[in-house]
Interface confidence: low
Amino acid sequence: TEPLRPELRCNPGQFACRSGTIQCIPLPWQCDGWATCEDESDEANCPEVTGEVRPHHGKEAVDPRQGRARGGDPSHFHAVNVAQPVRFSSFLGKCPTGWHHYEGTASCYRVYLSGENYWDAAQTCQRLNGSLATFSTDQELRFVLAQEWDQPERSFGWKDQRKLWVGYQYVITGRNRSLEGRWEVAFKGSSEVFLPPDPIFASAMSENDNVFCAQLQCFHFPTLRHHDLHSWHAESCYEKSSFLCKRSQTCVDIKDNVVDEGFYFTPKGDDPCLSCTCHGGEPEMCVAALCERPQGCQQYRKDPKECCKFMCLDPDGNSLFDSMASGMR
């Protein structure tokens, strides 16, 4: 028999399971074709859908909430006590590994240190569903300047500034080898951007060149980075340089897969018991499963990748535990 439980009050926007260890789930999970409540009450009394199958929001036979196939091996199920709504931490699950998230523009940024000319760099960013970075605010530029783009243990010397291709070009408008000109956005689709200041200087140039490419130089000596020290250079587009890509934020699951709009997923981060819906590139309506303490183990560590799985650290204990609850099917 099921243990008595206190009177259940789910938050608005949540569905109350009739019984079982999971109590509250996000409302959109009701009648979505996947049973989430243990008693499957979220899929009961649903309106009939014409046609052979229910709409599954484009999902395959694998339930992205748990990453398991329906009717899969029950030993992979982890028992949970309660699924509670949580406020999702802003920095988790919005950018793939290696990309840095900035809330101000809902974008992800990544520096590529492989030297490429401007056009190859632009193509590389495009292949990654992004473009060479442009900036819409001073704050966005400051965020980029403040990042540690390579291995944190590396000690930076004075010359370890980053020279990065970014998404602007300098068009020469003056005649007779005058360097007067203007910055333009190099690629269409960059809306509401600010244009850089005049390039501090341009290196010796060929007489035929009338378009140069933007190189943002960030000085990465720790005491100087806090001064936002940087400079803008108009360089030959054929010079090889590191480059800065920018892409829209996106939902990223715990296995570093990009998740499409409307799908359920466990966000990248430090809580494998979190389940969310991807909406506008952000995890929304998240619920966190709470696990029972593993029996017969004093000291334990949670498995960072699997929900309700523990490593027992007791000298005489079994090493691996699943947290079993009495209501498990």
């Epitope: 200041p197 005049d198 501090i200 200087f201 100087l224 936002d228 400079s231």
Partner: antibody, heavy 115, light 106 residues
């Protein structure tokens, strides 16, 4: 064409004040690092102060607390307010664009501090 | 604060190559710029970031920087190159100039 023109130099007594101006054309002062560099008669170059595009200001130890760098974006001009002047501040003062390197310089204005 | 040391004066015959040195502790870890200043004129940038030449500066000017020494080399020196030359770098001070080298073209 980029041009920097300094003015405001002259003879001043020790302890006195002077305000130097630097009118820029061909580029936007507020978008660039702008510095003052001085050169005492027959001596080498000495960096004095910088103002960043973001507005942060830095000074050489020798002038800290006495000199103030500023700019007027509407006039596209740079200024150096010099107070509590000393004999050792006597120099030609140049305004220059840049900070880690100076790619354009004005013609300079002579400041003489003497009683 | 960095201290940059230059030879006070050097002489060179026309069409010869001359090298002006600038030394400082671990200077090779920092970028160095070089300026030319003729009598009664403002300084002019001739080399930046160790070895890069701004547009308009003749190809006979070149630079390098490693270890504790940066060098400015003028190949095929001309009478018009007679001037004072200053090296410059930056650190937390933040800007430092060398004492200058008076180059005389004999």
């Amino acid at each position: 064409e980029v041009q920097l023109v300094e003015s405001g130099g002259g003879l001043v007594q020790p302890g006195g004040s002077l305000r130097l101006s630097c009118a820029a054309s061909g580029f936007t002062v507020s978008s660039n690092y702008m510095s003052w560099v001085r050169q005492a008669p027959g001596k080498g170059l000495e960096w004095v102060s910088v103002i960043y595009s973001g507005g942060s200001t830095y000074y050489a130890d020798s002038v800290k607390g006495r000199f103030t760098i500023s700019r007027d974006n509407a006039k596209n001009s740079l200024y150096l307010q010099m107070n509590s002047l000393r004999a050792e501040d006597t120099a030609v003062y140049y305004c220059a664009r840049g900070w880690t390197t100076f790619d354009y310089w004005g013609q300079g204005t002579l400041v003489t501090v003497s009683s | 604060q960095a201290v940059l040391t230059q030879p006070p004066s050097l002489s060179v015959s026309p069409r010869q190559t001359v090298t002006i040195t600038c030394s400082g502790d671990q200077l090779g870890d920092r970028y160095v710029s070089w300026y030319q200043q003729k009598p009664g004129q403002s300084p002019m940038l001739v080399i930046y970031q160790d070895d890069r030449r701004p547009s308009g500066v003749p190809e006979r000017f070149s630079g390098s920087n490693s270890g504790n020494t940066a060098t400015l080399t003028i190949g095929g020196t001309q009478a018009m190159d007679q001037a004072d030359y200053y090296c410059q770098t930056w650190d937390n001070s933040p800007v430092v100039f060398g004492g200058g080298t008076k180059l005389t073209v004999l």
